[in-house]
Interface confidence: medium
């Protein structure tokens, strides 16, 4: 698409325009106080040393002040996520000051050049904050810097350079290239603000990781493992955008961090919770759904301040669109015996039945392998609130749906042609809700029938002891 001129004109225009056409030299970083949710309102430009615009535009010295910092831009214009974020902040915090940091001329360059400009932009923001601190009633503790992509590292520099400590920095998928593994003073880090929270939505362990993989805040949240975001697959994107390309997938996943944050502002009645875990695989296994000792937190704007001695990595699953909230369940299935399993892992599905709704048929992802005479833990999640769980249907898929499994079955048959029926024995399923922290045990409907085999199902109902509550904190309760 063509590169329209921004508030300061295109960089090329500046370089080639004769001096006479310049009525004044425009700064490369401008601070636009958004005075309305409407993007057509021009807002007010603030500049260090000029108090009049603060008065003219009703800058509220005692209110929260948000600085939104965009990242690298290929188009040279503000993208729509910015409009959505401004609007959401105005909706949620009606008295707050919302300032858009416009560094388009410095960001609309080669990526490497834009990276080199982040320090300068950070300095400009710090200077603005230092000047505002000279005003009565303005408190740095009320300042919240929100930086997307490269803008997250700009926020880090600003927090580092300012005299005093900024209240909060939120990094929305901080940029990865040229920052991964960098020294803490050359990227966003926990010492840049009193509270630094980060959302990672485009991290890749292979190929180019657009977003930074390493934790860089007090809490680092990795929705859907921080890599493949639902609704951002090539098929999804091709379906919704006429000119869908791999670039659209990148944009979708990278920008998802912004939309998760917007969601937390506008859908505060549907908060998403993340759970502390050492890595994505353990989370996928369902091991990490605890809220004890500050191990869970709301994501986005509603995140509770946690200043851990070391980075806290947190994980959650989400829906493909707003509201992003899902309901997480840990399922502990004790397999006390199995027969003739061969090489192939079974494919299990569960359907959860609750007082409010029933789930869809949900796959049980086997991260490693099914262990016998052991408790196997799984993570399942539903898009709807099921209410109190009443019963569970466990199904073992019959005919294999993958060529790999078919091949393994065929090999199994060749080595043991008279392979008798495969069978598992399961007496009970223990379920824990991540959102309510409630635990419940389900027993087989018929205590005599505990076996399940391919193509068969097993029903479980709440055991007689009913709900078993452990003394654990629910994420819906305020966390310290």
């Amino acid at each position: 698409s063509p590169v329209p001129f921004g508030p300061e004109g295109r960089l090329e225009d500046k370089l080639h325009k004769p001096k006479a056409t310049q009525t004044e030299v425009k700064p490369s970083v401008r601070f636009n106080l958004r005075t309305s949710k409407d993007p057509e309102h021009e807002g007010c430009y603030l500049s260090v040393g000029h108090s009049q615009p603060l008065e003219d535009c009703s800058f509220n010295m005692t209110a929260k002040t948000f600085f939104i910092i965009h990242g690298w831009t290929m188009s040279g214009i503000f993208e729509n996520w910015l409009h959505k974020l401004v609007s959401a902040l105005h909706t949620r915090e009606k008295d707050a000051n919302v300032v858009v940091v416009d560094w388009l001329p410095l960001a609309h360059q080669l990526y490497t050049d834009a990276v080199n400009n982040t320090r300068v932009v950070g300095h400009s923001i710090a200077r603005m904050l230092d000047w505002l601190q000279e005003k009565d009633d303005f408190s740095l503790g009320n300042v919240h810097l929100i930086g997307y992509s490269l803008g997250a590292h700009v926020a880090g520099y600003a927090g580092n350079f300012v005299k005093g400590t900024v209240g909060r920095i939120t990094g929305l998928d901080p940029a990865g290239p040229m920052f991964e593994g960098a020294d803490i003073h050359k990227r966003l880090s926990p010492d840049d603000a009193d509270f630094v929270d980060v959302l990672h939505t485009y991290t890749r362990s292979f190929g180019l990781s657009i977003g930074i993989q390493m934790p860089v805040g007090h809490i680092d949240i990795y929705p859907n493992g921080g890599d493949f975001q639902p609704g951002c697959g090539l098929n999804d994107v091709l379906g919704s955008i006429a000119y869908g390309t791999i670039t659209e997938v990148v944009k979708c996943e990278h920008e998802r961090a912004v939309h998760l944050f917007v969601d937390s502002l506008v859908n505060q009645d549907k908060p998403s919770f993340a759970f502390q875990c050492t890595d994505s695989n353990r989370f996928k296994k369902g091991i990490c759904l605890s809220c004890r000792k500050n191990r869970c937190n709301s994501i986005g704007y509603n995140a509770k301040k946690m200043r851990n001695k070391r980075n806290s990595k947190m994980y959650l699953k989400t829906r493909a669109g707003m509201p992003f909230r899902v309901y997480h369940y840990q399922m502990k299935i004790h397999v006390f015996s199995y027969k003739n399993m061969g090489e192939i892992e079974p494919t299990f599905y569960v359907t959860l039945y609750g007082t409010n709704a029933d789930s869809q048929t949900l796959p049980l992802e086997i991260v490693e392998r099914i262990e016998q005479n052991a408790t196997n833990t799984f993570l399942v999640y539903t898009e709807e609130d099921l209410g109190d769980l009443l019963k569970i249907q466990l199904t073992w898929e019959g005919a294999s749906q993958s060529w790999y499994n078919l091949w393994k079955e065929f090999r199994s048959y060749l080595s043991q042609p008279r392979n008798p029926g495969r069978e598992l024995n399961i007496r009970r399923i223990r379920v824990k809700s991540g959102e309510t922290q409630r635990k419940l045990t389900f027993c087989t409907e018929d205590p005599e029938n505990t076996s399940i085999s391919p193509g068969r199902e097993l029903w479980f109902r709440k055991c007689r002891d009913g709900w078993r509550m452990k003394n654990e904190t629910s994420p819906t309760v305020e966390l310290p």
Epitope: D38, P39, F78
Partner: antibody
């Protein structure tokens, strides 16, 4: 290059409705809001309203709020403005104009669509 | 709504002369925008954010002012500059235009 091409002239009876289209090309349609401005013969310009094609949000001049509707079809990069309960003083030229979010000006305009309201 | 009053309504000048067009707002606005319109054509942006020249606009055009009083100046009129000029504000909805100043050949 950027182009905004509007639908052709219309003649309508009082009380009827008219729907003017504005097809955008040469840029990413969803990245700019589209505005509608009208001009009576020999008169000044009057802002009617806007639509953000990205998510369909609209903003209207109170004067037209109960009669104007802005819509868009992102699949064909087209914005529409429908004006209902037409009166003779709606006999004007209607322009669509592109506006970059937060950059504060109409940088490209359509060629205009003349609507004549006559019984 | 903010009312923009342009003066004079008509300005009769010769090529090479200086033209000064005024736009007064009924209440304070942050910035002013200026457009040029020729018969049968759509308006064309000249000045944005009070004093910034739009790309492709010659440097004989300049804008100034603040608060409620704004000015568009054409330092030396060229034959193609004879047209109607409108000021416009984006400070408050509805976004209003002035009534226009017609610059005609004397």
């Amino acid at each position: 290059q950027v182009q905004l091409v509007q639908s052709g002239a219309e003649v309508k009876k009082p009380g009827a409705s008219v729907k003017v289209s504005c097809k955008a090309s040469g840029y990413t349609f969803t990245e700019y809001t589209m505005h509608w401005v009208r001009q009576a013969p020999g008169q000044g310009l009057e802002w009617m309203g806007s639509i953000n094609p990205y998510y369909g949000g609209t903003s209207y001049n109170e004067k037209f709020k109960d009669r104007v509707t802005s819509t868009r079809d992102t699949s064909i990069s087209t914005a529409y403005m429908e004006l209902s309960r037409l009166r003779s003083d709606d006999t004007v030229v209607y322009y669509c104009a592109r506006y970059g979010n937060y950059v504060g000006y109409f940088d490209y305009w359509g060629q205009g669509t003349t609507v004549t309201v006559s019984s | 709504e903010i009312v923009l009053t342009q003066s004079p309504g008509t300005l009769s000048l010769s090529p090479g002369e200086r033209a000064t067009l005024s736009c007064r707002a009924s209440s304070s606005v942050h910035y002013m925008y200026w457009y040029q319109q020729k018969p049968g054509q759509a308006p064309r942006l000249l000045i944005y954010y009070t004093s910034n020249l739009a790309p492709g606009i010659p440097d004989r055009f300049s804008g100034s002012g603040s608060g409620t009083d704004f000015t568009l100046t054409i330092s030396r009129l060229e034959p193609e500059d004879f047209a109607v000029y409108y000021c416009q504000q984006f400070t408050s909805s509805p976004y209003t235009f002035g009534g226009g100043t017609k610059v005609e050949i004397k």
